[in-house]
Each structure stands twice: as structure tokens, then as C-alpha cells.
């Protein structure tokens, strides 16, 4: 077996794509290594090539099929085993039981765009992409503006615990630049986390009128 | 605290299946990361298997080559191994343990990791 400071870490997508994380430390910058999938229900099987993202880690993405299309069900159970070459020989290194729906990470909201602006505030609209149909409406949103002067970090977040593409952002200043990002998040799934932040969607309120208290 | 009691060991030729049982008794058994061990007669303790608190990932021994699964049901407070193509090296006490801390299934757990341990239950594959 792998010592105690390897890790081995994925998340679906709800569609058809399983992003995978192996760390270990001590491990070689250049060893081959590949996650490979195989689901107890399926025909198919699927590999992917773990690249190096640091000094001791590695990612890939099992591509299962189209974008869109549903791939794997809340009863499916995928095997998923990290393998790294030895030689000639592939060695196992570490071997998972992933049940798809309990790993849950959504890909990040897509399409922003700002419906309606006004001096104090902003009404903004988003899409989900590549998300499953089970989910229906049982999905939940955070969101955050950044303000001039500070940092991502320091925004609070805004919760909106239904399926609502939209936010009407209150009590902004006139003439005054903003960025806003959303991400996701199922309510279902042991592990399930948020999605990554959409890209930011950079606005900017309406000026106040000269002579008006607004 | 939870009490374990393992069951379904047994004598068995080469080849052939097994499917052990582990029953929890008084207390959260939801609660608790689970965990399958085995020792054979000389050996240290080696770990199998084990799976997280709502059952959303199982880590397994590389040495299992893909013949076991452990799988839990938290409505009826067990956690099974099912053993399949086993072979005479899989001869040993199977063990069932039971983890208080937090365990994400990421990693391979030491016995250390694990508070609280059944009996055990023999098993043994003939050739």
C-alpha cells in the first residue's frame, strides 16, 4: 500500500467528466502515471494521463464521453485505480471506489451577464453548464462582488440556497466599477464541494444624476 | 461507542467467494468511518479496506487486486467485505474496525487510525 502522505482525490462533474488529483511525496517529477475507471455497471472503461500541476502532484481528467451527455447514475459505482510505470510494468499504487454522486463538483457558471443596471444597483444573470438533469432544482448558488479597493478575499459571500441564475446586487455606489463571480454547488453527495468561481463579469453603475439625491 | 461484531468467515477452496459481515451496536454507526484488517499467522496486522462515513468513497489494499469490495449500509448499521477469486495467501483474521475521527477516503489509513476493533473472524482458503 501507499504510506499515509499520498492522496488520492476526484470529483464528477455530473456529466460525463472525472477530474482526479494524485499527490505523493517523494515521488518522482517524471514517473508515468494514469488513472484509469472502471465502472461496476458499464461497458466502457476510461484512462487519462496524470500530468504534473506541482512538486509532488499530478491531475487528469477522464473524459467519458460528449459534454452533455449522462454518463454515470446516482447507482453507479466507478473503480478507480492509479497506475505508474516500474520498467516495463505498470504498479498499482492506489485503488478507489468512487460513487459518482457522492463526489460531486459541478463546472463553474457560465454566461454572465448584466440584465439591468441602475445607480445603486445591478441585476446579473448566469447559466450551469454541463449540469446533471437529476438534479432538477436542488442546486444552490454563492456569489460575490468585489468592491474598489479590495480584494476576493474580503467580499462577502451571498447565498442563495435554491436554483436562481440571477441576483439583483443592492446598495452599490454611482459611477463605480465592480467585478462579480457565482459558483455552484448540488445539494446531494457525501464529498460534493462548490465549483470553481465563474470568470468575473465586470460591471459599472450608472453615474448619479447631477442636481438629484438618488 | 459502537461494538462490532464480525461474522461469515469460514473455510473455503481456491476460487471461491466470501462475504463477511460486521454488525454495530450502540451508537451512531454513521458516524463512524469503517475499516477491514486482516492478520495471518506470523504477520503484522495488514490493512484491506475501508470506506467513509456515508459510504461515498472506499479506499482498498493494492494487494486485493481488485477481488474485494466493501460496501456498508447505514440503515441497517453493518459493513461488508465480499471476497471473491480468493486465494490461499488471503488466509488470515479479518478484523473490523471503526474510526471516530474524520476520514476523507483519499488516503490509506493506518490501524492506528482506528479507536475501536471487533474479534475477528478466521478465514481460510485451501488449495
Known amino acids: 500500500a501507499v504510506n499515509g502522505t499520498s492522496q488520492f482525490t476526484c470529483f464528477y462533474n455530473s456529466r460525463a467528466n472525472i477530474s482526479c488529483v494524485w499527490s505523493q511525496d517523494g515521488a518522482l517529477q517524471d514517473t508515468s502515471c494514469q488513472v484509469h475507471a472502471w465502472p461496476d455497471r458499464r461497458r466502457w472503461n476510461q484512462t487519462c494521463e496524470l500530468l504534473p500541476v506541482s512538486q509532488a502532484s499530478w491531475a487528469c481528467n477522464l473524459i467519458l464521453g460528449a459534454p452533455d451527455s449522462q454518463k454515470l447514475t446516482t447507482v453507479d459505482i466507478v473503480t478507480l485505480r492509479v497506475l505508474c510505470r516500474e520498467g516495463v510494468r505498470w504498479r498499482v499504487m492506489a485503488i478507489q471506489d468512487f460513487k459518482p454522486f457522492e463526489n460531486l463538483r459541478l463546472m463553474a457558471p457560465i454566461s454572465l451577464q448584466v440584465v439591468h443596471v441602475e445607480t445603486h444597483r445591478c441585476n446579473i444573470s448566469w447559466e450551469i453548464s454541463q449540469a446533471s438533469h437529476y438534479f432538477e432544482r436542488h442546486l444552490e448558488f454563492e456569489a460575490r462582488t468585489l468592491s474598489p479597493g479590495h480584494t476576493w478575499e474580503e467580499a462577502p459571500l451571498l447565498t442563495l440556497k435554491q436554483k436562481q441564475e440571477w441576483i439583483c446586487l443592492e446598495t452599490l455606489t454611482p459611477d463605480t466599477q465592480y467585478e462579480f463571480q457565482v459558483r455552484v454547488k448540488p445539494l446531494q453527495g457525501e464529498f460534493t464541494t462548490w465549483s470553481p468561481w465563474s470568470q468575473p463579469l465586470a460591471f459599472r453603475t450608472k453615474p448619479a444624476a447631477l442636481g438629484k439625491d438618488t | 461507542e459502537v461494538q462490532l461484531v464480525e461474522s461469515g468467515g469460514g473455510l473455503v477452496q481456491a476460487g471461491g467467494s466470501l462475504r463477511l459481515s460486521c454488525a454495530a451496536s450502540?451508537?451512531?454507526?454513521?458516524?463512524?468511518?469503517m475499516g477491514w484488517f486482516r492478520q495471518a499467522p506470523g504477520k503484522e496486522r495488514e490493512f484491506v479496506a475501508a470506506t467513509t462515513r456515508g459510504g461515498g468513497r472506499t479506499m482498498y489494499a493494492v494487494s486485493t487486486e481488485g477481488r474485494f469490495t466493501c460496501s456498508r449500509d447505514n440503515a441497517k448499521n453493518t459493513v461488508y467485505l465480499q471476497m471473491n477469486s480468493l486465494k490461499p495467501k488471503d488466509t488470515a483474521i479479518y478484523y473490523c474496525a471503526a474510526m471516530t475521527s474524520y476520514y476523507s477516503g483519499t488516503y490509506y489509513p493506518d490501524s492506528s487510525d482506528f479507536d475501536i476493533w471487533g474479534q475477528g473472524t478466521q478465514v481460510t482458503v485451501s488449495s
Open positions: 450502540g451508537g451512531t454507526f454513521s458516524s463512524y468511518a
